[in-house]
């Protein structure tokens, strides 16, 4: 199933394991999405030479993919759990438009691409519950997202392949950093 089981968020351990604790659901969800990304990267790397390309910078100029920085408080040095959790949620919300772009980019892994997208939506919900006491999270502007999507889809084939590769790579790195940070929370 695309989404691991679980019901209401619960931070204090209960005597029974249903529902899952929020920490366990978040951890499992991220690992599930990472597995999906690996499968998608495999298809991308098999059908093009993008994974070995040295021309990534050309395509990266057109993208504004979320990236963890020191100021976000998600690294061991300068760790700040509240700042970090806001960054993780904001970053995932920003990735949503790029995950939408990926939806028609795969042939044999079409279902996997959909599963990654839907599982990310569920992960955002889990994290928003965990962050219920934090300041409001800024959501991306739908109009800006729509125009970005149109722009990405209008690229030539080479740039679309490179964009797909870069989205998957960046999303993987973002999730790995998020997973490490969330384990402390």
């Amino acid at each position: 199933a695309p989404v691991p089981p679980g019901e209401d968020s619960k931070d204090v351990a209960a005597p029974h394991r249903q529902p899952l604790t929020s920490s366990e659901r978040i951890d499992k969800q991220i690992r599930y999405i990472l597995d999906g990304i690996s499968a998608l990267r495999k298809e991308t790397c098999n059908k093009s030479n993008m994974c070995e390309s040295s021309k990534e910078a050309l395509a990266e100029n057109n993208l504004n993919l979320p990236k963890m920085a020191e100021k976000d408080g998600c690294f061991q040095s300068g760790f700040n759990e509240e700042t970090c959790l806001v960054k993780i949620i904001t970053g995932l919300l920003e990735f949503e438009v790029y995950l939408e772009y990926l939806q028609n980019r795969f042939e044999s892994s079409e279902e996997q691409a959909r599963a990654v997208q839907m599982s990310t939506k569920v992960l955002i919900q889990f994290l928003q519950k965990k962050a219920k006491n934090l300041d409001a999270i800024t959501t991306p502007d739908p109009t800006t997202n729509a125009s970005l999507l149109t722009k990405l889809q209008a690229q030539n084939q080479w740039l679309q392949d490179m964009t797909t590769h870069l989205i998957l790579r960046s999303f993987k790195e973002f999730l790995q950093s998020s997973l490490r940070a969330l384990r402390q929370m």
Epitope: F79, R180, A181, R183, Q184, M185
Partner: antibody, heavy 119, light 106 residues
Framework: EVQLVESGGGLVQPGGSLRLSCAAS????????MSWVRQAPGKGLEWVAK????????YYSDTVTGRFTISRDNAKNSLYLQMNSLRAEDTAVYYC????????????WGQGTTVTVSS | EIVLTQSPATLSLSPGERATLSCSAS?????MYWYQQKPGQAPRLLIY???NLASGIPARFSGSGSGTDFTLTISSLEPEDFAVYYC?????????FGGGTKVEIK
């Protein structure tokens, strides 16, 4: 040298309270989640509670929920466990433990402090 | 909560022999850890996330397994390895520990 030193243990009557402390040294304390784990005499290990690096999230075992409170003071590099409504079955050596950054493993442990609940 | 059962309770072996310790979980676990504890001392992390060797731990220690069945192997026992070994799991809170396996000198 990376070190955790517990203190505050002692003899207390059933229903009484005790506050344990754990002083961290040799590493930057603030990025690490911390836990308390206990070991009853001649028995195995039992996880008690965890606190996130900034103290925003706490987790407790079912046996201590509502009676024990975990807290920390990052400015003092210290972890605490406030234990109320103590019972005979809370008698144990209490260890504080650091969570390995980026993992759930408890990688550094103190030498423990003994809590005895008896009348 | 997840129950961990360790076997055997006691393992009597001689230095140089191979030790195989088992840990069985009541349901599938996300992460498994192994600790060594000597009398009067705090537990020491040996293995994390099923098979990763903790910092400063000799390569004769190794961990394996997934799901519900896990194994700690000590390839060739050294005199300092005689101690009690605990498995611990995390699959959400609470963390739980096995009852321990005592490795004693035969």
């Amino acid at each position: 040298e990376v070190q955790l030193v517990e203190s505050g243990g002692g003899l207390v009557q059933p229903g009484g309270s005790l506050r344990l402390s754990c002083a961290a040294s040799g590493f930057t304390f603030s990025p690490f989640a911390m836990s308390w784990v206990r070991q009853a005499p001649g028995k195995g290990l039992e996880w008690v509670a965890k606190i996130s690096p900034g103290g925003s999230w706490t987790y407790y075992s079912d046996t201590v929920t509502g009676r024990f409170t975990i807290s920390r003071d990052n400015a003092k590099n210290s972890l605490y466990l406030q234990m109320n409504s103590l019972r005979a079955e809370d008698t144990a050596v209490y260890y504080c433990a650091r969570q390995l950054w980026g993992y759930y493993a408890l990688d550094i442990w103190g030498q423990g402090t003994t809590v005895t609940v008896s009348s | 909560e997840i129950v961990l059962t360790q076997s055997p309770a006691t393992l009597s072996l001689s230095p140089g022999e191979r030790a195989t310790l088992s840990c069985s979980a009541s349901i599938s676990v996300s992460y498994m850890y192994w600790y060594q504890q000597k009398p009067g001392q705090a537990p020491r992390l040996l293995i994390y996330d099923m098979s990763n060797l903790a910092s400063g731990i000799p390569a004769r220690f190794s961990g394996s397994g997934s799901g519900t069945d896990f194994t700690l192997t000590i390839s060739s026992l050294e005199p300092e390895d005689f101690a009690v070994y605990y498995c611990m799991q995390w699959s959400g809170y609470p963390y739980t520990f096995g009852g321990g396996t005592k490795v004693e000198i035969k």
